[in-house]
Amino acid sequence: HNTTVFQGVAGQSLQVSCPYDSMKHWGRRKAWCRQLGEKGPCQRVVSTHNLWLLSFLRRWNGSTAITDDTLGGTLTITLRNLQPHDAGLYQCQSLHGSEADTLRKVLVEVLADPLDHRDAGDLWFPGESESFEDAHVEHSISRSLLEGEIPFPPTS
């Protein structure tokens, strides 16, 4: 899997999209996990509703939300109030039994807020963009990592 980079601005919301083959993954729940080290396990952050037919309901875990467009084949993850510690390597996964297939490897990069001070207009209010169908994301930039680029700093 290539790694796709999503860049967001600190303090704002970042939306990550993971496209997949809706027929191949029909009936499967999805998850978003954080890679712990280059060879470490992928720690589950949030998963879609336990009832696959309710995958359209947005599920939150802290400041991270997940929702699944099962017909269109797009898993959407929202990272609310992005912080520097959110930077790192993640995976979108398709679950089947105790197994998980990787849909996309994602490197989240957090850019410094260009404004040192933010007024109320910059704050994210809970509840907005609850639906993937018309979610609007500001400051979401994605690109694929070039072959040979390393998402983790080399260990000494």
């Epitope: 309901l57 099962t70 509840g127 609850e130 018309d134 979610a135």
Partner: antibody
Framework: EVQLVESGGGLVKPGGSLKLSCEAS????????MSWVRQTPEKRLEWVAA????????YYPDSMKGRFTISRDNAKNFLYLQMSSLRSEDTAMYYC??????????WGQGTTLTVSS | DIVMTQSHKFMSTSVGDRVSITCKAS??????VAWYQQKPGQSPKLLIY???TRHTGVPDRFTGSGSGTDYTLTISSVQAEDLALYYC????????FGGGTKLEIK
């Protein structure tokens, strides 16, 4: 404060049809999944149907499939429930409710449906 | 479907008392439980979500707890305005509700 106002209830004969409406205000309606929940005369709560924010996805519990259709008009901020082949056991107070993270965080005041000959 | 059982249909208490309303799920629901309060003539209002988190504006005398199949709503010091029906609700699978517990004030 979120506001949900149901309307359209009334007295219907068995086998009849009725469409309930719910007007939403003071929040970004299209950004939220919505549900209809009913409360029987015995005060039991039953989930009737759910619909995603954009209206593409709907869900009905097995017991509600076939006779109920949930829909929404995001341009007008309205949620609907079309009911057909009504039976006496459909007599209830019908509430629309907003979804947040699985649970239902705000409910309307309800509209009453009575099915009787 | 998951059955949510509220064993007490009625509970009688006095102002200032501590009262606990219980709810048992027919299978584990991983804390995907909410509690609603319905005062006479009103619609249900969300009190607690994810088993233990208070909704905005809910007084801190209301506390939720539990895991697995057993969940509890506790009112630490009952007030006259707490006279209401209380429902538990699981959103782990196809949504179901408890039968309700009516809190009566002596």
């Amino acid at each position: 404060e979120v506001q949900l106002v149901e309307s359209g209830g009334g007295l219907v004969k068995p086998g009849g049809s009725l469409k309930l409406s719910c007007e939403a205000s003071r929040f970004t309606f299209s950004s939220y999944a919505m549900s209809w929940v009913r409360q029987t005369p015995e005060k039991r709560l039953e989930w009737v149907a759910a619909i995603s924010g954009g209206g593409r996805y709907t869900y009905y519990p097995d017991s509600m499939k076939g006779r109920f259709t949930i829909s929404r008009d995001n341009a007008k901020n309205f949620l609907y429930l079309q009911m057909s082949s009504l039976r006496s056991e459909d007599t209830a107070m019908y509430y629309c409710a907003r979804h947040y993270d699985g649970y239902l965080d705000y409910w309307g005041q309800g509209t009453t449906l009575t099915v009787s000959s | 479907d998951i059955v949510m059982t509220q064993s007490h249909k009625f509970m009688s208490t006095s102002v200032g008392d501590r009262v606990s309303i219980t709810c048992k799920a027919s299978q584990g629901v991983s804390t995907a439980v909410a509690w609603y309060q319905q005062k006479p003539g009103q619609s249900p209002k969300l009190l607690i979500y994810w088993a233990s988190t208070r909704h905005t504006g809910v007084p801190d005398r209301f506390t939720g707890s539990g895991s697995g199949t057993d969940y509890t709503l506790t009112i630490s010091s009952v007030q006259a305005e707490d006279l209401a029906l209380y429902y538990c609700h699981q959103h782990y699978s196809t949504y179901t509700f408890g039968g309700g517990t009516k809190l009566e004030i002596k």
